[in-house]
């Protein structure tokens, strides 16, 4: 079971600001997908 | 039934430790993510600590940050809080909580920090 | 941090009454919002999540609405069970806050 979470439970100050200079849903989709990537999974579930 | 038991508290002295468990049965502890929040008696609820499923993702308010540690035993259905240098104002009830893993099926994420099965809570006081 | 803030913070109603308590945030968090009941000395109960959405088994007098920064919890007629205190808590971002409480108590 995999899970994408838009939201964190670390303090991530900059996530944050990118997550709240996003201007759109796609732009949002968009950086999740590369956030994944870049971390492996990150262990989601 | 889905229960959360809390234990481990009590009083202590500060600049002490104490060491609070939870033990979960009722669900599948391994599928969600567990948080530690608090309560001064007659006084609102605090976010302590949360941690993820695999322990991979940890994290704490700034009031206990470098103090408490959060940890889980997915083999024995536990949560665990370690509670180091411990200062008159820890003094709380402290609950255990499962995170509902929200889904928002409009943006596609799950989100954190939405608790819907709680224990009833293990007194903690810091006095000398 | 987000900065919860309810209304009012104590709340004087009768059986069947409808009860309305507000809830702001220091800025936007969009729908995710919860809301939680609790009871002298019980465990918080959740309410309602995502602004609207009832929790399962909550009656459905109970209600939840708004988005970005100010969000209602709406009881249509309170009964006696429900005498309590109410948090709303925002799950936008870390870390997670919640409002300072409103106690609703018997007229």
């Known amino acids: 079971k995999h899970k994408c979470f838009r939201n964190s439970l670390e303090n991530n100050e900059t996530l944050e600001s990118i997550m709240n200079t996003l201007e759109s849903e796609e732009d949002f989709r968009k950086y999740f997908y590369y956030l994944e990537g870049s971390k492996g999974g990150g262990g989601s579930k | 039934q889905v229960q959360l038991v809390e234990s481990g508290g009590g009083l202590v002295q500060p600049g002490r430790s104490l060491r609070l468990s939870c033990a979960a049965s009722?669900?599948?502890?391994?599928?969600?993510?567990m948080h530690w929040v608090r309560q001064v008696p007659g006084k609102g609820l605090e976010w302590v600590s949360g941690i993820n499923w695999n322990s991979g993702s940890i994290g704490y308010a700034d009031s206990v940050k470098g103090r408490f540690t959060i940890s889980r035993d997915n083999a024995k259905n536990s949560l665990f809080l370690q509670m180091n240098s411990l200062r008159a104002e820890d003094t709380a009830l402290y609950y255990c909580a499962k995170d509902i893993e929200y889904y928002d099926i409009l943006t596609g994420y799950y989100s954190y920090y939405i608790m819907d099965v709680w224990g009833q809570g293990t007194t903690v006081t810091v006095s000398s | 941090d987000i900065q919860m803030t309810q209304s009012p913070s104590f709340l004087s109603a009768s059986v069947g009454d409808r009860v309305t308590i507000t809830c702001w945030a220091s800025q936007g968090i969009s729908s995710y919002l919860a809301w939680y009941q609790q009871k002298p000395g019980k465990a918080p109960k959740l309410l309602i999540y995502a602004s609207s959405t009832l929790q399962s088994g909550v009656p459905s007098r109970f209600s939840g609405s708004g988005s970005g920064t100010e969000f209602t919890l709406t009881i249509s007629s309170l009964q006696p069970e429900d005498f309590a205190t109410y948090y709303c808590?925002?799950?936008?971002?870390?870390?997670?806050?919640f409002g300072q409480g409103t106690k609703v108590e018997i007229k």
């Open positions: 808590q925002q799950f936008n971002s870390y870390p997670p806050t």
């Open positions: 009722g669900f599948t502890f391994d599928d969600y993510a």
